[in-house]
Amino acid sequence: AVSEHQLLHDKGKSIQDLRRRFFLHHLIAEIHTA
């Protein structure tokens, strides 16, 4: 699983790319996205 901490500290990524990765993870893990 990719943690929020890892994603937010992944330099050079656009905000949408972070949302994209969160959402792909959400579709698999069914974590709440709010």
Epitope: D17, R20, F22, L27, I28, T33
Partner: antibody, heavy 118, light 115 residues
Framework: QVQLVESGGGVVQPGRSLRLSCAAS????????MSWVRQAPGKGLEWVAT????????YYPDSVKGRFTISRDNSKNTLYLQMNSLRAEDTAVYYC???????????WGQGTLVTVSS | QLVLTQSSSASFSLGASAKLTCTLS???????IEWYQQQPLKPPKYVMD???????STGDGIPDRFSGSSSGAERYLTISSLQSEDEADYYC?????????????FGGGTKLTVL
């Protein structure tokens, strides 16, 4: 290998309903989000619906919201698309697609043709 | 509004290099997109995702002749040493989540002809 096989397409009158199925094999179906994407004859691609791995979350574009329902039966490794109040503009080949951790539509089925005509 | 714009057609010679363009709406210029290939009478196939910095990840079975790059709001798919089997429609796509709603849009597609 990943295999997705759609079925249930055919000719249907405007205003009627149809249910499409997508039989999945070659991977753990219950571990991935799934989607439907359609393509009208001679036209481009249009996203239709997405469902999370366990079926708890569903997403639709405005063009089909309230008319189409995506669902899944993980015990049968099958994805569904219930299409109600069909319109001529819903005529298309409907593809099911599987996500990966990296992208939304990584694997595609061969498609099933839905024709809405009186 | 999230919009992707593609040229409707492009022609290149066998063995040449082809560069296809997908342009994001200006306010979405940093977005990651996806490229898909659809050969005649076949379903679409995932080619790659392409980020704003030009980094990309290719799909299963995609030859290394396929590469991606970015400049501003433009996303490019480059196919080197064109083969006859590269003749296909190429679509770009982009997804986003807004207020817990998901949206995904495709460009209109580019028909690539290999001469």
């Amino acid at each position: 290998q990943v295999q997705l096989v759609e079925s249930g397409g055919g000719v249907v009158q405007p205003g009627r309903s149809l249910r499409l199925s997508c039989a999945a094999s070659g991977f753990t179906f219950s571990s991935y989000g799934m989607s439907w994407v359609r393509q009208a004859p001679g036209k481009g691609l249009e996203w239709v619906a997405t469902i999370s791995s366990g079926g708890s979350y569903t997403y639709y574009p405005d063009s089909v919201k309230g008319r189409f329902t995506i669902s899944r039966d993980n015990s049968k490794n099958t994805l569904y698309l219930q299409m109600n109040s069909l319109r001529a503009e819903d005529t298309a080949v409907y593809y099911c697609a599987r996500q990966t951790t990296m992208t939304y539509f990584a694997y595609w089925g061969q498609g099933t043709l839905v024709t809405v005509s009186s | 509004q999230l919009v992707l714009t593609q040229s409707s057609s492009a022609s290149f010679s066998l063995g040449a290099s082809a560069k296809l363009t997908c342009t994001l709406s200006s306010q979405h210029s940093t977005y990651t997109i996806e490229w898909y290939q659809q050969q005649p009478l076949k379903p679409p196939k995932y080619v790659m995702d392409l980020k704003q910095d030009g980094s990309h990840s290719t799909g299963d079975g995609i030859p290394d002749r396929f590469s991606g790059s970015s400049s501003g709001a433009e996303r490019y798919l480059t196919i080197s040493s064109l083969q006859s089997e590269d003749e296909a429609d190429y679509y770009c796509g982009v997804g986003d989540t807004i207020k817990e709603q998901f949206v995904y849009v495709f460009g209109g597609g580019t028909k690539l002809t290999v001469l």
